[in-house]
């Protein structure tokens, strides 16, 4: 007999049950229906600290962390300074609007990557528009 | 909440010495802060003494502050600041306050006095 | 690096404009890292400006700053009782340093 299951009637990952008198979908966690064609609500009720934004998703709830905090629940402090952004001695802040870098004398750029020329001038390529050194990278 | 809080303030005889001791809460110097000093003497403005970068340990001082002061981190949530040779000009408020980015202090402890006198 | 405030002190009607300037002997870090500070008797300073001209989380808009590199500016439109204070201006300068203005004090009557 032909097998019904073959023609993934189920969505989003379900597992097709070929029960002869009807098919049946299990549907994995976060979806519903008879062919787990619902994608039920995976952020209700469910809260991100720290200003943290819930993301829907595979049927499990995701935060989307703010600069500074990390972990499934944005409840740890996460440091965006630990891969040492800012290049040559630069020092790094975390500042709620970015990270933030202060270069070390010599040095300028949002990352401290460029020389500069003992005239005053610098490597700099042309930055982008309303782009200064120390301005924040998001 | 963060919070800063000074601790070690008090009545000092003039070529003593005396350490402050600043208390993290709310957050810890596993991130990247300068962890500063400001002094601030009766009826003037403040004054910016020293600061420790808790992301390599280096510190900072200003000029009149080399020698006699030495900022240090003492744990996760405590800095000390260590002043020898003190003065009666040395009587002051003293400060604890953390640089985020921007050079700026945004968060303060409540200060603690230090009098320096015979 | 040194910075000065003028003038001092200041005096305001209540809902007047005050205007308080500070000019350093050189140029602050990336020609805007300057910040200004409300002080009240007993109190540590508190953040009004950050970068020149950023408003601090919380501050009311009344406050507004300005100017780059030597020269800056802190302006207080509609000025209220709540707003007698001392003020001062706050620099940060290549090599890690920091330094404060002297401070002026604003009166609101």
């Known amino acids: 007999r032909v097998d019904r299951c073959s023609l993934q009637p189920c969505r989003n990952g379900g597992l097709c049950l070929d029960l002869g008198h009807a098919l049946r979908c299990r549907c994995r966690a976060g979806f519903a229906g008879p062919r787990c064609e619902h994608d039920l609500d995976d952020c209700a009720g469910r809260a991100c600290a720290n200003g943290g934004t819930c993301v829907e998703g595979g049927g499990a709830h995701r935060c989307s962390c703010a600069l500074g905090f990390g972990g499934r629940d944005c409840r740890e402090r996460a440091d965006p300074c630990a891969a040492r952004p800012c290049a040559h001695g630069g020092r790094c802040y975390a500042h709620f609007s970015g990270l933030v870098c202060a270069c070390a004398p010599g040095y300028m750029g949002a990352r401290c990557e460029f020389p500069v020329h003992p005239d005053g001038a610098s490597a700099l390529p042309a930055a982008p528009p309303g782009l200064r050194p120390g301005d924040p990278q998001r | 909440q963060e919070q800063l809080v000074e601790s070690g303030g008090g009545l000092v005889q003039p070529e003593g010495s005396l350490t402050l001791t600043c208390t993290a809460s709310?957050?810890?110097?596993?991130?990247?802060?300068?962890m500063c000093w400001v002094r601030q003497a009766p009826g003037k403005g403040p004054e910016w003494i020293a600061c420790i970068y808790t992301g390599d340990g280096s510190t900072d001082y200003a000029s009149w502050a080399k020698g006699r002061f030495t900022v240090s981190k003492a744990s996760s949530t405590t800095v000390t600041l260590q002043m020898t040779s003190l003065a009666v000009a040395d009587t002051a408020t003293y400060f604890c306050?953390?640089?985020?980015?921007?050079?700026?202090?945004?968060?303060w402890g409540p200060g603690t006095l230090v009098t320096v006198s015979s | 690096q040194v910075l000065t405030q003028t003038p001092s002190p200041v005096s305001a009607a209540v809902g007047g404009t005050v205007t308080i300037s500070c000019q350093s002997t050189e140029s602050v870090y990336g020609s805007d890292w300057l910040s200004w500070y409300q002080q009240k008797p007993g109190q540590p300073p508190k953040v009004l400006i950050y970068?020149?001209?950023n408003l601090e989380i919380g501050v009311p808009s009344r406050f507004k700053g300005s100017g780059s590199g030597t020269q800056f500016t802190l302006t207080i439109s509609g000025a209220q009782c709540d707003d007698a204070a001392t003020y001062y201006c706050q620099g940060y300068y290549s090599g890690y340093i920091y330094a404060f203005g002297g401070g002026t004090e604003v009166v609101v009557k």
């Open positions: 306050a953390r640089n985020s980015g921007y050079g700026y202090f945004g968060l």
């Open positions: 709310g957050f810890s110097f596993s991130s990247s802060y300068d």
């Open positions: 970068q020149a001209s």
